[in-house]
């Protein structure tokens, strides 16, 4: 059932990276507007993005309250200019989203190599600990704060003169690797949550190479 000349939203899709979470849907509205509601499985519905002509709604503020909860959203369709109008069953047309559990499903954003420092034949590579929109005690938590040891980083490193990529892993944000003296190396990192079955890996960080300004070399 529904209101004359309104169509139900479809293709409801969660787009989420490092917990920044947007619900998207179709179609682009023609003579209609949308309102979104979100709820946990056991909670009450909360309305967001009231009577919007957008086909997306930022739900970050709601999901960051508890990223381990499972959320459900629904998109209501109303005739433009007559938002009080309801369908024959007494309620506006709506469509449910798939369930979404941020902790398990948010995409890992592209990491950044913060710095690297060579001391003799060792190189320390540090990955930037990206800030998320998840809050605790009024401070924003980093990705490491949220995921703890569930988050690991894989470092790919290679001699500038060769193509084979060696790997190292860390469950902190730092790597200490052995390198050959007098060789320049390039680095790229990838964030991984090994316990996941989907959305396990980030895209690779931009490549950083020795001899560029991010690095520091110390001979001892």
């Amino acid at each position: 059932s529904g209101t004359t000349n309104t169509v139900a939203a479809y293709n409801l899709t969660w787009k989420s990276t490092n917990f920044k979470t947007i619900l998207e849907w179709e179609p682009k509205p023609v003579n209609q507007v949308y309102t979104v509601q979100i709820s946990t499985k056991s909670g009450d519905w909360k309305s967001k993005c009231f009577y919007t002509t957008d086909t997306e709604c930022d739900l970050t503020d709601e999901i960051v309250k508890d990223v381990k909860q499972t959320y459900l959203a629904r998109v209501f369709s109303y005739p433009a200019g007559n938002v009080e109008s309801t369908g024959s069953a007494g309620e506006p047309l709506y469509e449910n989203s798939p369930e979404f559990t941020p902790y398990l499903e948010t995409n890992l954003g592209q990491p950044t190599i913060q710095s690297f420092e060579q001391v003799g034949t060792k190189v320390n590579v540090t990955v930037e600990d990206e800030r998320t929109l998840v809050r605790r005690n009024n401070t924003f938590l980093s990705l490491r704060d949220v995921f703890g040891k569930d988050l690991i980083y894989t470092l790919y490193y290679w001699k500038s003169s060769s193509s084979g990529k060696k790997t190292a892993k860390t469950n902190t944000n730092e790597f200490l690797i052995d390198v050959d003296k007098g060789e320049n190396y390039c680095f790229s990192v990838q964030a991984v949550i090994p316990s996941r079955t989907v959305n396990r890996k980030s895209t690779d960080s931009p490549v950083e190479c020795m001899g560029q300004e991010k690095g520091e070399f110390r001979e001892i």
Epitope: K165, K166, A168, K169, P194, D204
Partner: antibody, heavy 120, light 107 residues
Framework: EVQLVESGGGLVQPGGSLRLSCAAS????????IHWVRQAPGKGLEWVGY????????YYADPVKGRFTISADTSKNTAYLQMNSLRAEDTAVYYC?????????????WGQGTLVTVSS | DIQMTQSPSSLSASVGDRVTITCRAS??????VAWYQQKPGKAPKLLIY???FLYSGVPSRFSGSRSGTDFTLTISSLQPEDFATYYC?????????FGQGTKVEIK
Amino acid sequence: EVQLVESGGGLVQPGGSLRLSCAASGFTISDYVIHWVRQAPGKGLEWVGYIDPSNGYTYYADPVKGRFTISADTSKNTAYLQMNSLRAEDTAVYYCARDPQSFYIAFDYWGQGTLVTVSS
Amino acid sequence: DIQMTQSPSSLSASVGDRVTITCRASQDVNTAVAWYQQKPGKAPKLLIYSASFLYSGVPSRFSGSRSGTDFTLTISSLQPEDFATYYCQQHYTTPPTFGQGTKVEIK
């Protein structure tokens, strides 16, 4: 159910080529790293190389460097081991194995293996 | 490359015996060591990961421990199905390397 199935093994002459396949099911290879490991008759396990299908990065053991190439086709969810300039010492059962890229776990699933015999 | 020196290369034991296999890494590998069991004509199976953690579905008679760069696999009470070859592996750095294997045979 997670499964890895190797194929393509057989008898090949020294100097010849062979391409092995590792077909994965129950998971998406681009979410993992795929390794090749071999075992000569009556011998131990020897690591051959790996590919990260999400970025194409590879690395090879010294004995096969320049002769073997690992690739992946994510649309087919399959990894490959192209073996060129084969030698008698490459005779082995070749396994592919899944690496969850964990700080803790190494190779959690292995294929059943495919036998490559290099002989004239 | 990191060498994993495994010993003994073979041992004979009886059902119910306590069996210990050791592996020494040539340099620090943190806890990035796994143990595998392999039976003839079959692929290796993961037993122990991160030096001391039992992999899912593996009987509790298997255990692993670490002391510095020395790693130990222990079978507390050998069962008939445990006669096999066991390998250690470090995955701390590329290339990952295996020990030479220990064949556990029936006495």
